[in-house]
Protein backbone atom coordinates (compact mmCIF):
# COMPACT_ATOMS: atom_id res chain seq x y z
CA UNK A 1 0.00 0.00 0.00
CA UNK A 2 2.81 2.40 0.85
CA UNK A 3 4.25 2.28 -2.67
CA UNK A 4 1.47 4.19 -4.39
CA UNK A 5 -0.11 5.66 -1.25
CA UNK A 6 2.60 6.99 1.05
CA UNK A 7 1.28 8.49 4.24
CA UNK A 8 0.81 12.23 3.96
CA UNK A 9 2.74 14.73 6.03
CA UNK A 10 1.40 17.83 7.74
CA UNK A 11 3.17 21.03 8.73
CA UNK A 12 2.15 24.47 9.93
CA UNK A 13 3.45 27.86 8.81
CA UNK A 14 4.81 29.93 10.44
CA UNK A 15 4.70 27.39 13.25
CA UNK A 16 2.57 25.48 15.72
CA UNK A 17 2.40 28.13 18.44
CA UNK A 18 0.34 30.99 17.08
CA UNK A 19 -0.66 34.25 18.80
CA UNK A 20 -4.37 34.97 19.02
CA UNK A 21 -5.52 36.81 15.90
CA UNK A 22 -2.54 35.82 13.79
CA UNK A 23 -2.73 33.59 10.74
CA UNK A 24 -1.61 30.01 10.31
CA UNK A 25 -1.45 27.79 7.26
CA UNK A 26 -1.55 24.01 7.45
CA UNK A 27 0.34 22.35 4.61
CA UNK A 28 -0.60 18.81 3.63
CA UNK A 29 1.78 16.93 1.36
CA UNK A 30 1.37 13.71 -0.57
CA UNK A 31 2.37 12.10 -3.87
CA UNK A 32 1.64 13.46 -7.31
CA UNK A 33 -1.86 12.63 -8.54
CA UNK A 34 -3.82 13.59 -5.44
CA UNK A 35 -7.34 14.78 -6.25
CA UNK A 36 -8.48 15.84 -2.78
CA UNK A 37 -6.65 16.73 0.40
CA UNK A 38 -8.61 16.65 3.62
CA UNK A 39 -7.52 18.44 6.80
CA UNK A 40 -9.11 16.74 9.79
CA UNK A 41 -9.60 18.26 13.21
CA UNK A 42 -10.03 15.23 15.40
CA UNK A 43 -11.10 16.78 18.66
CA UNK A 44 -14.27 18.11 17.02
CA UNK A 45 -14.42 15.53 14.24
CA UNK A 46 -14.52 18.33 11.69
CA UNK A 47 -12.68 18.56 8.39
CA UNK A 48 -12.07 20.71 5.37
CA UNK A 49 -11.59 19.43 1.83
CA UNK A 50 -9.81 21.05 -1.06
CA UNK A 51 -9.05 20.15 -4.65
CA UNK A 52 -6.74 23.14 -4.93
CA UNK A 53 -3.67 20.93 -5.16
CA UNK A 54 -0.32 22.17 -6.40
CA UNK A 55 2.87 20.35 -7.31
CA UNK A 56 5.50 20.94 -4.63
CA UNK A 57 8.20 18.90 -6.38
CA UNK A 58 8.41 16.37 -9.21
CA UNK A 59 7.25 13.65 -6.82
CA UNK A 60 5.12 15.56 -4.34
CA UNK A 61 1.89 17.54 -4.30
CA UNK A 62 0.53 19.78 -1.58
CA UNK A 63 -2.50 21.71 -0.42
CA UNK A 64 -2.65 24.65 1.94
CA UNK A 65 -5.37 25.37 4.49
CA UNK A 66 -5.21 28.89 5.90
CA UNK A 67 -6.82 30.29 9.02
CA UNK A 68 -6.71 34.06 8.70
CA UNK A 69 -7.32 34.95 12.32
CA UNK A 70 -6.62 32.24 14.84
CA UNK A 71 -9.01 31.93 17.79
CA UNK A 72 -8.65 29.91 20.97
CA UNK A 73 -11.11 27.42 19.53
CA UNK A 74 -8.68 26.62 16.73
CA UNK A 75 -6.25 25.03 19.13
CA UNK A 76 -6.08 21.27 18.92
CA UNK A 77 -4.89 18.30 16.93
CA UNK A 78 -4.87 18.32 13.13
CA UNK A 79 -3.98 15.69 10.56
CA UNK A 80 -4.13 15.19 6.80
CA UNK A 81 -5.46 12.50 4.52
CA UNK A 82 -5.73 12.49 0.73
CA UNK A 83 -7.74 10.84 -2.01
CA UNK A 84 -5.79 9.65 -5.02
CA UNK A 85 -8.43 7.91 -7.12
CA UNK A 86 -9.54 5.32 -6.45
CA UNK A 87 -8.09 5.17 -2.93
CA UNK A 88 -7.91 7.10 0.31
CA UNK A 89 -4.51 7.21 1.95
CA UNK A 90 -3.82 6.56 5.57
CA UNK A 91 -3.80 9.55 7.89
CA UNK A 92 -0.75 11.62 8.70
CA UNK A 93 0.55 11.95 12.21
CA UNK A 94 -1.14 14.55 14.37
CA UNK A 95 0.09 18.10 14.54
CA UNK A 96 -0.90 20.11 17.60
CA UNK A 97 -1.76 23.78 17.16
CA UNK A 98 -1.30 25.93 20.26
CA UNK A 99 -2.87 29.37 20.52
CA UNK A 100 -1.42 31.87 22.95
CA UNK A 101 -2.25 35.38 24.08
CA UNK A 102 -0.77 37.84 21.62
CA UNK A 103 2.23 39.71 22.98
CA UNK A 104 3.02 41.59 19.82
CA UNK A 105 1.84 42.20 16.27
CA UNK A 106 0.36 39.51 14.01
CA UNK A 107 3.83 38.63 12.74
CA UNK A 108 5.72 39.02 15.96
CA UNK A 109 8.68 36.65 16.34
CA UNK A 110 7.15 34.65 19.16
CA UNK A 111 5.80 31.98 16.83
CA UNK A 112 7.83 28.80 16.76
CA UNK A 113 9.40 27.86 13.43
CA UNK A 114 7.47 25.60 11.11
CA UNK A 115 6.85 22.16 12.53
CA UNK A 116 5.75 19.05 10.72
CA UNK A 117 4.59 15.52 11.25
CA UNK A 118 5.53 12.88 8.73
CA UNK A 119 5.23 9.13 8.27
CA UNK A 120 5.74 6.81 11.18
CA UNK A 121 4.57 3.27 11.73
CA UNK A 122 1.49 2.11 9.89
CA UNK A 123 -1.71 2.01 11.94
CA UNK A 124 -3.43 -1.33 12.33
CA UNK A 125 -6.60 -0.16 10.61
CA UNK A 126 -7.40 2.12 7.70
CA UNK A 127 -10.86 3.04 8.92
CA UNK A 128 -11.57 6.43 10.41
CA UNK A 129 -14.02 8.27 12.61
CA UNK A 130 -17.19 9.96 11.44
CA UNK A 131 -16.91 13.56 10.35
CA UNK A 132 -18.95 16.72 10.52
CA UNK A 133 -19.77 18.87 7.48
CA UNK A 134 -17.02 20.59 5.54
CA UNK A 135 -16.86 23.78 3.58
CA UNK A 136 -17.67 23.67 -0.13
CA UNK A 137 -14.66 23.18 -2.35
CA UNK A 138 -14.04 23.18 -6.08
CA UNK A 139 -15.98 21.07 -8.52
CA UNK A 140 -14.36 18.72 -10.98
CA UNK A 141 -15.37 15.82 -13.16
CA UNK A 142 -13.19 12.88 -14.06
CA UNK A 143 -13.50 9.93 -16.40
CA UNK A 144 -12.04 6.44 -16.03
Amino acid sequence: QEEDLPRPSISAEPGTVIPLGSHVTFVCRGPVGVQTFRLERDSRSTYNDTEDVSQASPSESEARFRIDSVREGNAGLYRCIYYKPPKWSEQSDYLELLVKESSGGPDSPDTEPGSSAGPTQRPSDNSHNEHAPASQGLKAEHLY
Partner: antibody
Framework: EVQLQQSGPELVKPGASVKISCKAS????????MNWVKQSPEKSLEWIGE????????IYNQKFKAKATLTIDKSSSTAYMQLKSLTSEDSAVYYC???????????WGQGTLVTVSA | DIQMTQTTSSLSASLGDRVTISCRAS??????LNWYQQKPDGTVKLLIY???RLHSGVPSRFSGSGSGTDYSLTISNLEQEDIATYFC?????????FGGGTKLEIK
Protein backbone atom coordinates in the same frame (compact mmCIF):
# COMPACT_ATOMS: atom_id res chain seq x y z
CA GLU B 1 -27.05 3.83 12.34
CA VAL B 2 -25.94 4.42 8.76
CA GLN B 3 -28.83 4.08 6.33
CA LEU B 4 -29.16 4.60 2.59
CA GLN B 5 -32.81 4.68 1.56
CA GLN B 6 -33.43 4.41 -2.17
CA SER B 7 -36.51 5.38 -4.14
CA GLY B 8 -39.00 2.77 -5.34
CA PRO B 9 -39.15 0.68 -8.53
CA GLU B 10 -39.55 2.38 -11.87
CA LEU B 11 -41.23 1.19 -15.06
CA VAL B 12 -40.18 3.39 -17.95
CA LYS B 13 -40.51 3.39 -21.72
CA PRO B 14 -37.57 3.01 -24.12
CA GLY B 15 -35.96 6.35 -24.90
CA ALA B 16 -37.18 7.96 -21.70
CA SER B 17 -35.17 9.06 -18.66
CA VAL B 18 -35.42 8.15 -15.01
CA LYS B 19 -34.03 9.73 -11.86
CA ILE B 20 -33.54 7.61 -8.77
CA SER B 21 -32.65 8.85 -5.32
CA CYS B 22 -30.65 7.71 -2.32
CA LYS B 23 -31.28 9.46 0.99
CA ALA B 24 -28.49 9.13 3.53
CA SER B 25 -28.90 9.25 7.29
CA UNK B 26 -26.93 8.36 10.39
CA UNK B 27 -23.67 10.00 9.30
CA UNK B 28 -22.20 13.18 7.87
CA UNK B 29 -23.35 13.12 4.25
CA UNK B 30 -20.57 15.36 2.95
CA UNK B 31 -17.81 13.26 4.47
CA UNK B 32 -18.05 10.26 2.18
CA UNK B 33 -18.18 9.63 -1.55
CA MET B 34 -21.46 8.23 -2.82
CA ASN B 35 -21.12 5.53 -5.46
CA TRP B 36 -23.62 3.90 -7.79
CA VAL B 37 -23.54 0.28 -8.92
CA LYS B 38 -25.60 -1.52 -11.55
CA GLN B 39 -26.65 -5.15 -11.18
CA SER B 40 -28.03 -6.99 -14.15
CA PRO B 41 -28.30 -10.76 -14.67
CA GLU B 42 -26.01 -10.59 -17.71
CA LYS B 43 -23.17 -8.52 -16.29
CA SER B 44 -23.31 -9.01 -12.53
CA LEU B 45 -22.20 -5.84 -10.68
CA GLU B 46 -20.82 -2.85 -12.53
CA TRP B 47 -19.47 0.35 -11.01
CA ILE B 48 -21.10 3.43 -12.56
CA GLY B 49 -19.36 6.27 -10.79
CA GLU B 50 -19.00 8.32 -7.65
CA UNK B 51 -19.70 11.83 -6.42
CA UNK B 52 -17.98 13.64 -3.57
CA UNK B 53 -20.63 15.68 -1.74
CA UNK B 54 -18.04 17.94 -0.12
CA UNK B 55 -16.40 19.20 -3.30
CA UNK B 56 -18.88 18.21 -6.00
CA UNK B 57 -16.20 16.20 -7.75
CA UNK B 58 -17.49 13.34 -9.90
CA ILE B 59 -15.72 10.33 -11.35
CA TYR B 60 -17.52 8.24 -13.96
CA ASN B 61 -16.82 4.84 -15.36
CA GLN B 62 -16.24 5.73 -19.02
CA LYS B 63 -18.77 3.08 -19.99
CA PHE B 64 -21.58 4.98 -18.25
CA LYS B 65 -20.54 8.56 -19.02
CA ALA B 66 -23.19 9.02 -21.68
CA LYS B 67 -25.83 7.17 -19.70
CA ALA B 68 -25.66 8.38 -16.10
CA THR B 69 -25.60 11.79 -14.44
CA LEU B 70 -24.79 11.98 -10.75
CA THR B 71 -25.94 14.86 -8.56
CA ILE B 72 -26.45 15.60 -4.88
CA ASP B 73 -28.63 17.78 -2.68
CA LYS B 74 -26.65 18.52 0.46
CA SER B 75 -29.61 20.14 2.19
CA SER B 76 -31.52 16.86 2.18
CA SER B 77 -28.49 14.54 2.30
CA THR B 78 -29.68 12.91 -0.91
CA ALA B 79 -27.78 11.60 -3.91
CA TYR B 80 -29.41 11.23 -7.31
CA MET B 81 -28.64 9.33 -10.46
CA GLN B 82 -30.38 10.14 -13.72
CA LEU B 83 -30.31 7.57 -16.52
CA LYS B 84 -31.16 8.77 -20.01
CA SER B 85 -32.03 7.30 -23.42
CA LEU B 86 -33.11 4.10 -21.75
CA THR B 87 -33.07 0.76 -23.54
CA SER B 88 -33.80 -2.77 -22.42
CA GLU B 89 -30.11 -3.14 -21.54
CA ASP B 90 -30.61 -0.58 -18.80
CA SER B 91 -33.16 -2.77 -17.05
CA ALA B 92 -31.41 -3.63 -13.80
CA VAL B 93 -31.22 -3.05 -10.08
CA TYR B 94 -29.26 0.08 -9.21
CA TYR B 95 -27.57 0.49 -5.82
CA CYS B 96 -26.09 3.49 -4.09
CA UNK B 97 -23.19 2.69 -1.80
CA UNK B 98 -21.07 4.75 0.58
CA UNK B 99 -17.36 4.59 -0.16
CA UNK B 100 -15.37 4.58 3.06
CA UNK B 101 -11.80 5.24 4.12
CA UNK B 102 -11.40 1.47 4.14
CA UNK B 103 -11.52 1.83 0.33
CA UNK B 104 -14.62 -0.30 0.13
CA UNK B 105 -18.37 0.12 -0.20
CA UNK B 106 -19.14 -0.15 3.48
CA UNK B 107 -22.89 0.56 3.30
CA TRP B 108 -25.39 -0.09 0.52
CA GLY B 109 -28.89 1.05 -0.26
CA GLN B 110 -31.60 -1.58 -0.72
CA GLY B 111 -31.54 -1.18 -4.50
CA THR B 112 -33.92 0.33 -7.04
CA LEU B 113 -35.32 -1.85 -9.80
CA VAL B 114 -35.58 -0.07 -13.15
CA THR B 115 -37.54 -1.87 -15.85
CA VAL B 116 -37.47 -0.55 -19.39
CA SER B 117 -40.39 -1.81 -21.40
CA ALA B 118 -42.70 -0.55 -24.09
CA ASP C 1 -10.06 -2.57 -16.99
CA ILE C 2 -9.11 -5.22 -14.45
CA GLN C 3 -11.15 -8.41 -14.85
CA MET C 4 -12.22 -10.16 -11.68
CA THR C 5 -13.00 -13.85 -12.08
CA GLN C 6 -14.88 -16.07 -9.66
CA THR C 7 -14.56 -19.42 -11.39
CA THR C 8 -17.15 -21.13 -9.22
CA SER C 9 -20.54 -19.59 -9.91
CA SER C 10 -22.38 -21.84 -7.46
CA LEU C 11 -21.32 -23.95 -4.53
CA SER C 12 -23.17 -26.48 -2.37
CA ALA C 13 -22.10 -27.14 1.20
CA SER C 14 -23.49 -28.52 4.44
CA LEU C 15 -24.08 -26.59 7.62
CA GLY C 16 -20.93 -26.57 9.71
CA ASP C 17 -18.67 -26.98 6.68
CA ARG C 18 -15.61 -24.90 5.97
CA VAL C 19 -16.20 -23.13 2.67
CA THR C 20 -13.66 -21.31 0.52
CA ILE C 21 -14.60 -19.00 -2.35
CA SER C 22 -11.90 -17.90 -4.78
CA CYS C 23 -11.38 -14.76 -6.82
CA ARG C 24 -8.70 -13.98 -9.38
CA ALA C 25 -7.72 -10.59 -10.78
CA SER C 26 -6.35 -10.13 -14.28
CA UNK C 27 -3.42 -8.21 -12.81
CA UNK C 28 -1.86 -7.47 -9.43
CA UNK C 29 -4.27 -5.46 -7.27
CA UNK C 30 -1.97 -4.94 -4.30
CA UNK C 31 -4.39 -6.42 -1.75
CA UNK C 32 -7.14 -3.89 -2.54
CA LEU C 33 -9.69 -6.68 -2.58
CA ASN C 34 -13.08 -6.51 -0.86
CA TRP C 35 -15.75 -9.16 -0.31
CA TYR C 36 -19.51 -8.55 -0.23
CA GLN C 37 -22.47 -10.71 0.69
CA GLN C 38 -25.77 -10.38 -1.15
CA LYS C 39 -28.77 -12.03 0.44
CA PRO C 40 -31.63 -13.44 -1.69
CA ASP C 41 -33.68 -10.31 -0.96
CA GLY C 42 -30.99 -8.17 -2.59
CA THR C 43 -29.46 -6.78 0.58
CA VAL C 44 -25.71 -6.20 0.16
CA LYS C 45 -23.21 -6.05 3.01
CA LEU C 46 -19.47 -5.55 3.20
CA LEU C 47 -17.72 -8.49 4.84
CA ILE C 48 -13.99 -7.98 4.34
CA TYR C 49 -11.89 -5.12 3.04
CA UNK C 50 -8.23 -4.88 2.07
CA UNK C 51 -8.00 -8.66 1.61
CA UNK C 52 -8.32 -9.72 5.24
CA ARG C 53 -9.77 -6.98 7.44
CA LEU C 54 -13.15 -7.78 8.94
CA HIS C 55 -15.78 -5.06 8.65
CA SER C 56 -17.42 -4.08 11.91
CA GLY C 57 -20.20 -6.41 13.00
CA VAL C 58 -19.16 -9.25 10.70
CA PRO C 59 -18.89 -12.65 12.45
CA SER C 60 -15.36 -13.93 12.98
CA ARG C 61 -16.13 -17.12 11.06
CA PHE C 62 -15.51 -15.04 7.92
CA SER C 63 -11.89 -14.51 6.93
CA GLY C 64 -10.00 -13.43 3.84
CA SER C 65 -6.56 -14.04 2.44
CA GLY C 66 -4.51 -13.67 -0.70
CA SER C 67 -2.06 -11.43 -2.50
CA GLY C 68 -1.12 -10.36 -5.99
CA THR C 69 -3.84 -11.71 -8.23
CA ASP C 70 -5.30 -14.57 -6.16
CA TYR C 71 -7.66 -14.08 -3.23
CA SER C 72 -10.09 -16.13 -1.21
CA LEU C 73 -12.92 -15.81 1.28
CA THR C 74 -13.34 -18.55 3.89
CA ILE C 75 -16.37 -19.30 6.05
CA SER C 76 -15.09 -21.55 8.80
CA ASN C 77 -18.37 -22.93 10.12
CA LEU C 78 -21.21 -22.50 7.66
CA GLU C 79 -24.50 -21.31 9.13
CA GLN C 80 -27.93 -21.08 7.58
CA GLU C 81 -27.78 -17.30 7.51
CA ASP C 82 -24.68 -17.47 5.30
CA ILE C 83 -26.73 -18.65 2.34
CA ALA C 84 -26.13 -15.86 -0.13
CA THR C 85 -24.13 -14.81 -3.16
CA TYR C 86 -20.60 -13.56 -2.55
CA PHE C 87 -18.84 -11.00 -4.72
CA CYS C 88 -15.24 -9.87 -4.79
CA UNK C 89 -14.29 -6.36 -5.87
CA UNK C 90 -10.96 -4.75 -6.66
CA UNK C 91 -10.25 -1.19 -5.62
CA UNK C 92 -6.70 -0.78 -6.87
CA UNK C 93 -7.47 0.99 -10.14
CA UNK C 94 -10.39 2.69 -11.85
CA UNK C 95 -12.86 1.61 -12.89
CA UNK C 96 -13.62 -0.43 -9.79
CA UNK C 97 -14.65 -3.90 -10.90
CA PHE C 98 -16.49 -6.89 -9.40
CA GLY C 99 -16.33 -10.62 -9.81
CA GLY C 100 -19.32 -12.47 -11.24
CA GLY C 101 -20.38 -13.84 -7.87
CA THR C 102 -20.49 -17.23 -6.19
CA LYS C 103 -23.88 -18.46 -5.03
CA LEU C 104 -23.67 -20.53 -1.88
CA GLU C 105 -26.37 -23.14 -1.33
CA ILE C 106 -27.12 -25.79 1.29
CA LYS C 107 -26.70 -29.44 0.36
Amino acid sequence: EVQLQQSGPELVKPGASVKISCKASGYSFTGYFMNWVKQSPEKSLEWIGEIHPSTGSIIYNQKFKAKATLTIDKSSSTAYMQLKSLTSEDSAVYYCARFDYSNSFAYWGQGTLVTVSA
Amino acid sequence: DIQMTQTTSSLSASLGDRVTISCRASQDISNYLNWYQQKPDGTVKLLIYYTSRLHSGVPSRFSGSGSGTDYSLTISNLEQEDIATYFCQQGNTLPRTFGGGTKLEIK
